[in-house]
């Protein structure tokens, strides 16, 4: 099982939309896939996919989840608020036929406030 996540870095303005994509691939077929999005280590949602459908479409505050066959799991945040800023990780596990799990690399989301004066030292506070 392979999970690739993108983008690595996403900078959006407050009130706009942010899209995080997780590509889940496995050489053999799977019957049920458990997926999970976390933000700063806290679980936003943990639905599963079976028969081509997600068991849940909501993922955290203002988060919508979608699955596009063959391999794309998308988390869409709309509208984005300042507290959406953080480190997002996508995780996946094939539950059936046999357990195999993997996770993506971090997507760092930066949300710029509508009021630019609130933006002081933002980049400096997130090194790397």
């Amino acid at each position: 099982l392979s999970v690739q996540q993108g983008p690595n870095l996403l900078q959006v303005r407050q009130g706009s939309q942010a899209t995080l994509v997780c590509q889940v691939d496995q050489a053999t077929a799977w019957e049920r896939l458990r997926v999970k999005w976390t933000k700063d280590g806290a679980i936003l949602c943990q639905p599963y996919i079976t028969n081509g459908s997600l068991s849940l479409g909501v993922c955290g505050p203002q988060g919508r989840l979608s699955w596009q066959a063959p391999s794309h799991l998308t988390l869409q945040l709309d509208p984005v608020s300042l507290n959406h800023s953080g480190a997002y990780v996508c995780w996946a596990a094939v539950e059936i036929p046999e357990l195999e799990e993997a996770e993506g690399n971090i997507t760092r989301l930066f949300v710029d406030p509508d009021d630019p004066t609130q933006n002081r030292n933002r980049i400096a506070s997130f090194p790397g």
Epitope: D25, A27, T28, A29, W30, N51
Partner: antibody, heavy 120, light 113 residues
């Protein structure tokens, strides 16, 4: 460019253990999302998948031969090793190693194969 | 195990004519989750290793001549060579990767009539 090369004995006696090595060049076997496989083909017959080892170290075997097979990898040498116990003349075949990726599921790169004859 | 049954065992076709090889699987190779068929076709010339031609039942590998095409879904699959060339003389195998153990068809030997 990825190349795979099988090596091992060309002749083994019945009941002996066969050890085959697949040396991978141009690509690291530690790269995530790849499976390293052994496949064999008796003369004039069909291909038969034997075993695989995944990046994580997880293994899978053909149930019909599982009790006789062990697949391992030596990352320091970039090699995948197959051992097959209790060899029999019906195990005479060309043995191939091949890779397979999660993004795909097909055998993309194959070694040239090594013919192993089992005879006393 | 998924059993792959190929037909015919051998096939003789005139140069420039169409060659059709069939592959039947003992269970569906289509996944409703990924909307893919887990079926590949390989060509093996005498003394050589197999080479991938078609993956996911109908996608031609880059560099494979467009006279080769794959079709089918579920349990019934076909490899078609629209206009046989001399270099197409080989054995052809289907292979499923829906589940392990990964299994191959018995092969079809293609010759020139």
């Amino acid at each position: 460019q990825i190349t795979l090369k099988e090596s091992g004995p060309t002749l083994v006696k019945p009941t002996q253990t066969l050890t085959l090595t697949c040396t991978v060049s141009g690509f690291s076997i530690t790269t995530g999302g790849y499976y390293w496989n052994w496949i064999r083909q008796p003369p004039g017959k069909k291909l038969e998948w034997l075993a695989l080892i995944y990046t994580s170290g997880r293994t899978s075997y053909n149930p019909s031969l599982k009790s006789r097979l062990t697949i391992t990898k030596d990352t320091s040498k970039n090699q995948v090793v197959l051992t097959m116990t209790n060899m029999d003349p019906v195990d005479t075949a060309t043995y191939y190693c091949a890779d397979m990726a999660d993004k795909g599921g097909w055998f993309a790169y194959w070694g040239q194969g090594t013919l192993v004859t089992v005879s006393s | 195990d998924i059993v792959m049954t190929q037909s015919p065992d051998s096939l003789a076709v005139s140069l420039g004519e169409r060659a059709t090889i069939n592959c039947l699987s003992s269970q569906s190779l289509f996944s409703s989750n990924t909307k893919r068929n887990y079926l590949n076709w390989y060509q093996q010339k005498p003394g050589q290793s197999p080479k991938l031609l078609i993956y996911h039942a109908s996608t031609r590998l880059s560099g494979v001549p467009d006279r080769f095409s794959g079709s089918g879904s579920g349990t019934d699959f076909t490899l078609t060579i629209s206009s046989l060339q001399a270099e197409d003389v080989a054995d052809y195998f289907c292979q499923q990767h829906y589940e392990t153990p990964l299994t191959f068809g018995d092969g079809t030997r293609l010759e020139i009539k």
